[in-house]
């Protein structure tokens, strides 16, 4: 089939595509805040089939301002064009759109994690989904940052296989009775801007020497 490519792009909305817990989440905001839709419908096309305009079933007539596209957007080699329609009742208020290349436009949100402090080490438990699609791995590296008294150390644990299930990393050779903070994030091979998690901090318990010193006082 030959076609002039439909011009779907227009910038009256801002869109963001994020990998959140290894799910592709598209979120949007309206630039004109005086428009208040009661619901949205999200559609998209692919550059190789630009005359088609597929409705995202789980984001048709939705009141949310985000949409999970994990099961729809699979290819990092395909350009996607989203079309967002906003409605008030049965009236269409607007239609806006944006082009995406997942490999370029995806931002990677940090995974959930917990820390437990011991005398001279910290266990960092990173929570990944139990199953992660191969194409959503994106050549990502896990980075764990340890901060104490103004010094930042980067740890890049090697994860065998893909990032799925829970993963525990031990930051060792730490100083007892010291405050440590930990941040976790995903780093992409293309050196895109990273999104670091908020810091989680723990004061390590005192070691044996300081305990005996305390009791000698």
């Amino acid at each position: 089939i030959s076609y002039d490519s439909p011009d779907y792009t227009d910038e009256s909305c801002t869109f963001k595509i994020s990998l959140r817990n290894f799910r592709s989440i598209l979120s949007w905001e309206l630039k004109n805040h005086s428009i208040v839709p009661t619901h949205y419908t999200l559609l998209y096309t692919i550059m190789s089939k630009p005359e088609d305009l597929k409705v995202v079933k789980n984001c048709a007539n939705t009141t949310r301002s985000f949409c999970d596209l994990t099961d729809e957007w699979r290819s990092t080699h395909e350009a996607y064009v989203t079309v967002l329609e906003g409605f008030s009742g049965n009236t269409t208020l607007f239609s806006c759109s944006h082009n995406f290349w997942l490999a370029i436009d995806m931002s990677f949100e940090p995974p959930e994690f917990e820390i437990v402090g011991f005398t001279n080490h910290i266990n960092v438990m990173v929570k990944f989904p139990s199953i992660v699609e191969e194409e959503l791995q994106f050549d990502l590296s896990l980075v764990i940052e340890e901060q104490s008294e103004g010094i930042v150390k980067k740890h890049k644990p090697e994860i065998k296989g893909n990032m799925s299930g829970n993963f525990t990393y031990i930051i060792d050779k730490l100083i007892p009775n010291t405050n440590y903070c930990v941040s976790v994030y995903l780093e992409h091979s293309d050196e895109q801007a990273v999104i670091k998690s908020p810091l989680k901090c723990t004061l390590l318990p005192p070691g044996q020497e300081s305990e005996s010193a305390e009791s000698a006082k």
Partner: nanobody, 117 residues
Framework: QVQLQESGGGLVQPGGSLRLSCAAS????????MKWVRQPPGKGLEWVST????????RYAESVKGRFTISRDNAKNTLYLQLNSLKTEDTAMYYC??????????RGQGTQVTVSS
């Protein structure tokens, strides 16, 4: 199985108008984007226009922009294409189809539009 039946074609002089219809059945018409494509004599299929389920988003090929209007009536399960200011190069067999690559469908028999003086 998606069923589509086009109608409304005919012989018209340059500058004239026609309104094509496409009656849809066997699927939930109101949930899908729809499109018109055409096949000029001896050529391949060309995309003409696309409309979203609500009708809120419409797109046109450059060659028909400003002359053709796509619309739909979800209550009647019908897709329309209004053809104005027709030119000889609009002569073609016109087909409607679901604008969704994941939908298995057979093309209807089409409706012939001939623009000639």
């Amino acid at each position: 199985q998606v069923q589509l039946q086009e109608s409304g074609g005919g012989l018209v002089q340059p500058g004239g108008s026609l309104r094509l219809s496409c009656a849809a059945s066997e699927f939930t018409f109101s949930e899908y984007s729809m499109k018109w494509v055409r096949q000029p004599p001896g050529k391949g299929l060309e995309w003409v226009s696309t409309i979203s389920p609500s009708g809120g988003t419409t797109r046109y090929a450059e060659s028909v922009k400003g002359r053709f209007t796509i619309s739909r009536d979800n209550a009647k399960n019908t897709l329309y294409l209004q053809l104005n200011s027709l030119k000889t190069e609009d002569t073609a067999m016109y087909y409607c189809s679901v604008a969704d690559w994941s939908v298995t469908q057979r093309r209807g028999q089409g409706t012939q539009v001939t623009v000639s003086s």
